[in-house]
């Protein structure tokens, strides 16, 4: 079930998912001057069975000027830079992405991909927050947010994070030492 709202915005902080729950959709967006190939996929979709999850469909971009040249997934080293999204922030290639059952890893970039990724999360997805450079994290609790559903309405829990002052950046889970990121809450209706 899709989350019909966005993770909370925390001043001076960004968020990302360590892994994506099955059902997550990623828009196939192309950078300026390029467009999706005709009959190309609109979205990549995280799908799978009990043992393995992967991204279905392939995003392909072609030059808006030419008709038939297709550009497929060929990651270039210079393309591995961090990307943020309009709707759902999630930088590329997190350091630690545990192979959680029912989750997909960050998809590799495709050629001429837009600079911003737009994810559509599902109920049970967890995202993690960190303070931007120059701000220090004051934790009152977990710096994470989970999409939950109650009475058919979706909402993200409020992360217990305040970013303050002029200090070194805090880190996402797993960036200090490798460890499995916590599994997202089960996708079920919260009791009313």
């Amino acid at each position: 079930e899709l989350c019909d709202d966005d993770p909370p915005e925390i001043p001076h902080a960004t968020f990302k998912a360590m892994a994506y729950k099955e059902g997550t959709m990623l828009n196939c967006e192309c950078k300026r001057g390029f467009r999706r190939i005709k009959s190309g996929s609109l979205y990549m979709l995280c799908t799978g069975n009990s043992s393995h999850s992967s991204w279905d469909n392939q995003c392909q971009c072609t030059s808006s000027a030419t008709r038939n040249t297709t550009k497929q997934v060929t990651p270039q080293p210079e393309e591995q830079k961090e990307r943020k999204t309009t709707e759902m922030q999630s930088p590329m290639q997190p350091v630690d992405q545990a192979s959680l059952p029912g989750h997909c890893r960050e998809p590799p970039p495709w050629e001429n991909e837009a600079t911003e990724r737009i994810y559509h999360f599902v109920v049970g997805q967890m995202v993690y927050y960190q303070c931007v450079q120059g701000y220090r994290a004051l934790h009152r609790g977990p710096a994470e947010s989970v999409c939950k559903m109650t009475h058919g309405k979706t909402r993200w829990t409020q992360p217990q994070l305040i970013c303050t002052g002029e200090m070194e950046t805090s880190q996402f889970p797993g960036e200090e030492k490798p460890q499995a990121s916590p599994e997202g809450r089960p996708e079920s209706e919260t009791s009313c």
């Epitope: 079930e1 899709l2 019909d4 059902g23 979709l45 599902v122 559903m149 309405k153 979706t154 996708e187």
Partner: antibody, heavy 116, light 106 residues
């Protein structure tokens, strides 16, 4: 109480455009996406797309990508949907519906008739 | 796109009858939602997340199912229940609805 009040019925010529409004009250407008749904005469419901009023971000059903443009005005708590290059097949009732999950509140609908 | 197929398209029934409407999704979905619509009116949320009754909906309505097969049941049809019913999925974009089932007087 939550209310979504839509603009009145419109009769338009083929090739023209129309802008339907949906004024929200009784809740925080920017806290919920606003979705639009079409119902052609005697037909079922079709999802057109949504807008996130706080960011202006839109997502469309590909079928309506070149037909509908959804916007929102935070200052008046109003969502809009403009339909362009109208054809007779666009004759339908257009509904706005509050998102955030299931559509628990709907506008009363706006009938757009396209006729020469 | 996930196609939603409702059956039957039209159902003729009498007050007091037990009525069952089925909805099949072309792919597995998390939940099904159901709306009721009367002529000239906007749809009204009836059942959300497969089996939960929306506020003010009588207990004679119930929903069940999982995966690709879902059911809406009215245990004892009342005069106010003659309407068109739509199933709806919001597990993936584009969001889709069934074509509708019209419950009419026999």
């Amino acid at each position: 109480q939550v209310q979504l009040v839509q603009s009145g019925a419109e009769v338009k010529k083929p090739g023209s455009s129309v802008k339907v409004s949906c004024k929200a009250s009784g809740y925080t407008f920017t806290s919920y996406r606003m979705h639009w749904v079409r119902q052609a005469p005697g037909q079922g419901l079709e999802w057109i797309g949504y807008i996130n009023p706080s960011k202006g971000y839109t997502e469309y059903n590909q079928k309506f990508k070149d037909k509908a443009t959804i916007t929102a005005d935070e200052s008046t708590n109003t969502a809009y949907m403009e339909l362009s290059s109208l054809r007779s097949e666009d004759t339908a009732v257009y509904y706005c519906a509050r998102g955030g999950g299931v559509f628990d509140y709907w506008g009363q609908g706006t009938l757009v008739t396209v006729s020469s | 796109d996930i196609q939603m197929t409702q059956s039957p398209s039209t159902l003729s029934a009498s007050v007091g009858d037990r009525v069952t409407i089925t909805c099949s999704a072309s792919s597995s979905i998390s939940y099904m939602h159901w709306y009721q619509q009367k002529p000239g009116k906007a749809p009204k949320l009836l059942i959300y997340t497969t089996s939960n009754l929306a506020s003010g909906v009588p207990a004679r309505f119930s929903g069940s199912g999982s995966g690709t097969e879902f059911t809406l049941t009215i245990s004892s049809l009342q005069p106010d229940d003659f309407a068109t019913y739509y199933c709806h999925q919001r597990s993936t974009y584009p969001l889709t609805f069934g074509q509708g089932t019209k419950v009419e007087v026999k």
